[in-house]
């Protein structure tokens, strides 16, 4: 027979309040006879977890069934696990002796330590918009967490970013932490869509980590480009002007026609379309009379999007003698 | 404390199937290992098997290939079959209980009460 | 596989103290049993776990198990004691039975 080996395969067990906890022990050897008894601590002050021959724990339960002739895993079980069960815990072989059992030999150790999982990451972006080409900086927090040690990164459409800086507090001892990053992203014209994800990763997780995410549509804004043109058929005594809108996000927009400086409120047709990158357009007819005291106009067509400056677009109407003539012509 | 009683056919021809059936009577059927034991005639006592109330079993590795001890648990009791039986099984079987209870480990239970024990003679 | 050896007899005036031996490899590492079997009766426990005596038995039996030899002592033997003696250990899930000793009161 080789000699007996106590294995405790963990050096440390992270656990979370109120959860089960289970610390591994097999033993190499069925001899020499006697019992497996589990300690949390070292020394005379040891406290007694669990011991299959005698006493009431009902809180710890096996892995195995300690009846069988064979067995050699002495796993427990410990329920409903507290602050007050931090410590080190040792599964200790007693061989059997007169009048009592005597310790031949300890596994050792498992130290078991509170876990805390960290909380979904939470991330905000800037306050205001800001237009393509510029950065803006993303922040990205999750709280109360233990043991200290945390993987934070960020992405963008699944890319890695690595322009970002990240604190985790205290830096001392404490019972749980927090993280705060921030990273810093360029917008792209087509970011309408995009995401950005904080990824934290954490030994309480088992390997799957937890995400936050932020469109970076509430961060970006594209400003559109105008075009005004004259459709170059007339509808009776009215030419059709058209003004294009293109490439704008978000949707927020005032759009004002003026003829000669003068703002116009009669009613125009308009459409909206969305394009697939997210951004829109939108493309508004203005009609404009044709008469024979109207020799040049000029229209404007002026939009206002997201509260920004406004921009507009002039249109100087051409209307050719033979327009007016068939414009008086069809005049009764 | 359990007692046994054990009954089952104690006349075979070779190649036959022996079987015994021991019944429990007081005692937690669930805290005990139940076993088989045989003595041939003039011999010393040779352990054939033994079973837990869950069905757990451990053989004789020189009788491993022939034998099946099972439980019914319903009933309390629990029987041997031993397959192709030869003159050499010849004996007086045993049947014993191995008291665990809730105190104990792994190979600190024997088998503190033994049946009145059934004679079987195989033969042509 | 594992053995238990015992020497086929032993013989004891009454009322002095026979002493059976069991030897095998480390038995000392295992737990002995000595079970006790009168002629034509089905076997007894008369030690258990080494030195441990059953309900029921006297004291005259005891044991002790150290090294490779376990010892079952019979002190003040009467001629009741008479009987075949068997002594067993575990050995992997196997129950493994010494070949028995004959106790003779003289």
């Known amino acids: 027979e080789e000699e007996l080996q106590m294995i405790q395969p963990e050096k440390l067990l992270l656990v979370t309040v109120g959860k089960t906890a289970t610390l591994h022990c097999t033993v190499t050897s069925l001899l020499p006879v006697g019992p497996v008894l589990w300690f949390r601590g070292v020394g005379p002050g040891r406290e007694l977890i669990y011991n299959q021959k005698e006493g009431h724990f009902p809180r710890v339960t096996t892995v195995s069934d300690l009846t069988k002739r064979n067995n050699m895993d002495f796993s427990i079980r410990i329920s409903s696990i507290t602050p007050a069960d931090v410590g080190t815990y040792y599964c200790v072989k007693f061989r059997k002796g007169s009048p009592e059992n005597v310790e031949f030999k300890s596994g050792p150790g498992t130290e078991m330590a509170l876990g805390a999982k960290p909380s979904a990451p939470v991330v905000l972006g800037p306050a205001a918009r800001t237009t393509p080409e510029h950065t803006v900086s993303f922040t990205c927090e999750s709280h109360g967490f233990s043991p200290r040690d945390i993987t934070l990164k960020w992405f963008k459409n699944g890319n890695e970013l690595s322009d970002f800086q990240t604190n985790v507090d205290p830096t001392g001892q404490s019972v749980a932490y927090s993280i705060r990053s921030t990273a810093r992203v360029v917008l792209d014209p087509w970011d309408v869509r995009s995401q950005v994800i904080c990824e934290v990763a954490h030994v309480t997780l088992q390997g799957d980590p937890l995400r936050g995410t932020a469109n970076l549509s509430e961060a970006i804004r594209v400003p559109p480009t105008l075009e005004v043109t004259q459709q170059p058929m007339r509808v009776g005594n009215q030419v059709n002007v058209t003004c294009q809108v293109r490439k704008f996000y978000p949707q927020s927009l005032q759009l004002t026609w003026s003829e000669n400086g003068n703002v116009c409120q009669r009613e125009t047709a308009s459409t909206l379309t969305e394009n697939k990158d997210g951004t829109y357009n939108w493309t508004s007819w203005f009609l404009v009379n044709i008469s024979d005291q109207r020799d040049d106009v000029v229209l404007t067509c002026q939009v206002k999007h997201d509260g920004q400056l406004a921009v507009s677009k002039r249109l100087a109407l051409e209307v050719t003698v033979h327009q007016k003539d068939q414009s008086s012509d069809a005049t009764p | 404390q359990v007692q046994l009683q054990q009954w089952g056919a104690g006349l075979l021809k070779p190649s036959e199937t022996l079987s015994l059936t021991c019944a429990v009577y007081?005692?937690?059927?669930?805290?005990?290992?139940w076993n088989w034991i045989r003595q041939p005639p003039g011999k010393g006592l040779e352990w054939i098997g033994e079973i837990n109330h869950s069905g757990s079993t451990n053989y004789n590795p020189s009788l491993k290939s022939r034998v099946i001890i099972s439980v019914d648990t319903s009933k309390n009791q629990f029987s041997l079959k031993l397959s192709s039986v030869t003159a050499a099984d010849t004996a007086v079987y045993y049947c014993?209980?191995?008291?665990?209870?809730?105190?104990?480990?792994?190979?600190?239970?024997?088998?503190?009460?033994w049946g009145q024990g059934t004679t079987v003679t195989v033969s042509a | 596989s594992y053995e238990l050896t015992q020497s086929p007899s032993v013989s004891v005036s009454p009322g002095q103290t026979a002493s059976i031996t069991c030897s095998g490899d480390k038995l000392g590492d295992r737990y002995a049993w000595w079970y006790q079997q009168k002629p034509g009766q089905s076997p007894v426990l008369v030690i258990?776990?080494?030195?441990k005596r059953p309900s029921g038995i006297p004291e005259r039996f005891s044991g002790s198990n150290s090294g490779n030899t376990a010892t079952l002592t019979i002190s003040g033997t009467q001629a009741m004691d008479e009987a075949d003696y068997y002594c067993q250990a575990w050995d992997s899930s196997t129950a493994v039975f010494g070949g028995g000793t004959k106790l003779t009161v003289l």
């Open positions: 014993a209980s191995s008291h665990y209870g809730s105190g104990s480990f792994p190979d600190s239970y024997g088998m503190d009460v």
């Open positions: 258990y776990q080494d030195d």
């Open positions: 007081g005692g937690s059927f669930s805290t005990y290992y």
